[in-house]
């Protein structure tokens, strides 16, 4: 992937949801869509003291770009204070910085809809000497708005006195006009109407439509998820075709098997994207046994706008196998968020990289949307690792203080799953005193008894990594749950917490 600078968004709560007597409050900053790592997030808290925490970066599934969140917790007279989140991305350029200044919370308002309309071609389908762009800003709660026109991202010197505002009932609308010469319009530049309102930015962009199909149609073919393969036992593979121009010609996707055997009936979905391109998805159910035995599946794509047919193949990953090690732990209580807690799960040293991560509570699998899991990343060795993060509420842990992180992976035995239980308050879990039983959150390699080192000949923890049961045969202080070896070019992850 090529270098991509981040988009930065402020994260605030609604003012009405913050108790008036709250002594501290948390706000955040999301940096998303960047590549490669890292970004550096710093905060300007004015006269107030604050503590910051930047979460590990997550990989965005389709693009392979990264996203990360930085949280700031401040106490004191925060209500009248403005805070600035400063995001630096040196891979974009040494001085690439984006600042977002905002207050702790946002008041209720109806945001505007921004839409650019453009003047028509003449009867012969040709562009007139000048082209008018009309920016319609509609349906917002009356208040100050700021309209800026951009040409290829650069602010234009435009007379905005022509902008007119009208009010219909409780909502307002504004429109601004931009006149361009035919030469500018045909130069293939992108024109953006950018609206700033209530500290937020809304925009719409337009450019001369391409004469033909957007270049660079791409096709991708996924492997079945281990969850679908081993737990649901109904694996599917998906052929994804992106960046097609909507046209009269339809995309033709044909499935086949290298063995020549027939394929099942596939389902197809077409979606128009915001950039005007079309995405086509075809999903094919495959036989669990066929897949495990190494069948190769092929997706052939043809389209009038594709110079030649595209073929994508997928089959079971070859190479060495290694079962995942699963470690689960709870973060300590954070000031001002006593009713929420974050659980984390480190899954590492597995091969190949295909893995499914689930969280369970009360023997029920939690929806995938509840947790955020990074894409597999290579460890220093030959395996892969992922982190998964789950936010739980007091109501949940008071109902039952046991959450399970489960990894589904082909090399895990006996049933392709490895799981670890974690409690928010491990000393109280199950009504037993911690000293009377093996703690829930002693972090050990998968496949071994909790708190006990692997049998002779098996792998033992690295000297820098700890299983904090306070046992003499494990190195390191008892309060350290686990320390993951520093990966190349990255800061070391260190997790602490009472065992």
């Amino acid at each position: 992937a090529s270098t991509q600078s981040p988009s930065v968004f402020p994260l605030t709560r609604c003012c009405k949801n913050i108790p008036s007597n709250a002594t501290s409050v948390t706000l955040g900053c999301l940096a998303t869509g960047y590549f490669p790592e890292p970004v550096m997030v710093t905060w300007d808290t004015g006269s107030l003291n604050g503590t910051t925490m930047t979460l590990p970066a997550t990989t965005l599934t389709l693009s392979g770009h990264y996203a990360t969140i930085s949280l700031l917790t401040v106490s004191g007279a925060w209500a009248k204070q403005m805070f600035t989140c400063r995001v630096a991305h040196t891979p974009s350029s040494t001085d690439w910085v984006d600042n977002k200044t905002f207050s702790v919370c946002s008041r209720d308002f109806t945001p505007p809809t921004v839409k650019i309309l453009q003047s028509s071609c003449d009867g012969g389908g040709h562009f007139p000497p000048t082209i008018q762009l009309l920016c319609l800003v509609s349906g917002y709660t009356p208040g100050t708005i700021n309209i800026t026109w951009l040409e290829d991202g650069q602010v234009m010197d435009v007379d905005l006195s022509t902008a007119s505002t009208t009010q219909e009932g409780e909502l307002a609308s504004t429109q601004s006009e931009l006149t361009l010469s035919q030469k500018h319009w045909l130069s293939d530049r992108t024109y953006t109407c950018q609206v700033t309102y209530q500290g937020h930015t809304f925009e719409d962009s337009t450019k001369k439509c391409a004469d033909s199909n957007p270049r660079g149609v791409s096709a991708y073919l996924s492997r079945p998820s281990p969850f679908d393969l081993f737990i649901r036992k109904s694996p599917t593979i998906t052929c994804l075709v992106v960046d097609l121009a909507p046209s009269k010609g339809t995309v033709n996707l044909t499935w086949s098997r290298a063995s020549g055997k027939p394929v099942n009936h596939s389902t197809r979905k077409e979606e128009k994207q915001r950039n005007g391109t079309l995405t086509v998805t075809s999903t094919l159910p495959v036989g669990t046994r066929d897949w495990i035995e190494g069948e190769t599946y092929q997706c052939r794509v043809t389209h009038p706008h594709l110079p030649r047919a595209l073929m994508r193949s997928t089959t079971k990953t070859s190479g060495p196998r290694a079962a995942p090690e699963v470690y689960a732990f709870a973060t300590p209580e954070w000031p001002g968020s006593r009713d929420k807690r974050t659980l984390a799960c480190l899954i590492q040293n597995f091969m190949p990289e295909d893995i499914s991560v689930q969280w369970l509570h009360n023997e029920v699998q939690l929806p995938d949307a509840r947790h955020s899991t990074t894409q597999p990343r290579k460890t220093k060795g030959s395996g892969f690792f992922v982190f998964s993060r789950l936010e739980v509420t007091r109501a949940e842990w008071e109902q039952k203080d046991e959450f399970i992180c489960r990894a589904v992976h082909e090399a895990a035995s006996p049933s392709q799953t490895v799981q670890r239980a974690v409690s928010v308050n491990p000393g109280l879990a199950g009504g037993s005193a911690q000293s009377q039983r093996a703690p829930d959150r002693v972090l050990c390699h998968s496949g071994q008894q909790q708190g006990l080192p692997r049998a002779a000949g098996g792998s033992v923890p690295h000297p820098r990594c700890h299983c904090g049961a306070g046992r003499a045969d494990w190195p390191g202080p008892p309060e350290l749950d686990v320390c993951v070896e520093e990966a190349e070019g990255e800061a070391p992850w260190t997790w602490t917490g009472l065992c």
Partner: antibody, heavy 119, light 110 residues
Framework: QVQLVESGGGLVQPGGSLRLSCAAS????????MTWVRQAPGKGLEYVSI???????WYANWASGRFTISRDNSKNTVYLQIDSLRAEDTATYYC?????????????WGQGTLVTVSS | DIQMTQSPSSVSASVGDRVTITCQAS??????LAWYRQKPGQPPKLLIY???TLASGVPSRFSGSGSGTEYALTISSLQPEDFATYYC????????????FGGGTKVEIK
Amino acid sequence: QVQLVESGGGLVQPGGSLRLSCAASGFTLSNHDMTWVRQAPGKGLEYVSIINTYGNHWYANWASGRFTISRDNSKNTVYLQIDSLRAEDTATYYCARETHHGSSGIDHWGQGTLVTVSS
Amino acid sequence: DIQMTQSPSSVSASVGDRVTITCQASESIYSGLAWYRQKPGQPPKLLIYDHSTLASGVPSRFSGSGSGTEYALTISSLQPEDFATYYCQHADYAHHSDNVFGGGTKVEIK
């Protein structure tokens, strides 16, 4: 077996025109994208143009305007029309068949027809 | 445009030698890199497609590898008929302005 036979090459003066033909046999032409590739004497392969199964066509940027690719599936023939010929167009022109399943290159080539542009 | 850069432009080797030719694309290729062998006076012949799949009838001494932007063709034990010129081709889809072939590598007798 699959056969591609080019014809229409020869000696032509600068500024002249030529229409190259490629007769296909041993397979169903309408199932395949077809390509013209040229090779100047002692030089490497150079992609000229491609026509897909829908009849839509693309050209190398230097070829756009003077070269026209077309196909007649009923006659099992692919054509390449070259106008305003220049000395640098002197080359062997190969007609080639793209693999049916796609993304896999050219699985069959003709023997080529030599075009010589000289006054 | 995706540009294909082949190296070396020529290599001298003997029968039985192991020879590796590389091809670098100016941007990632998802699938569809092909390799050809061309003998003097003949059209090219497809050796490898989809990065690493051996074309029908091609001896197993030929192998293809690579992903993203870096690709290689390896001849494990050079035979007399392998003294020829080799070309890589980006065969995923032809953009109208691409020359989809590499510049060629001539394998000569030492």
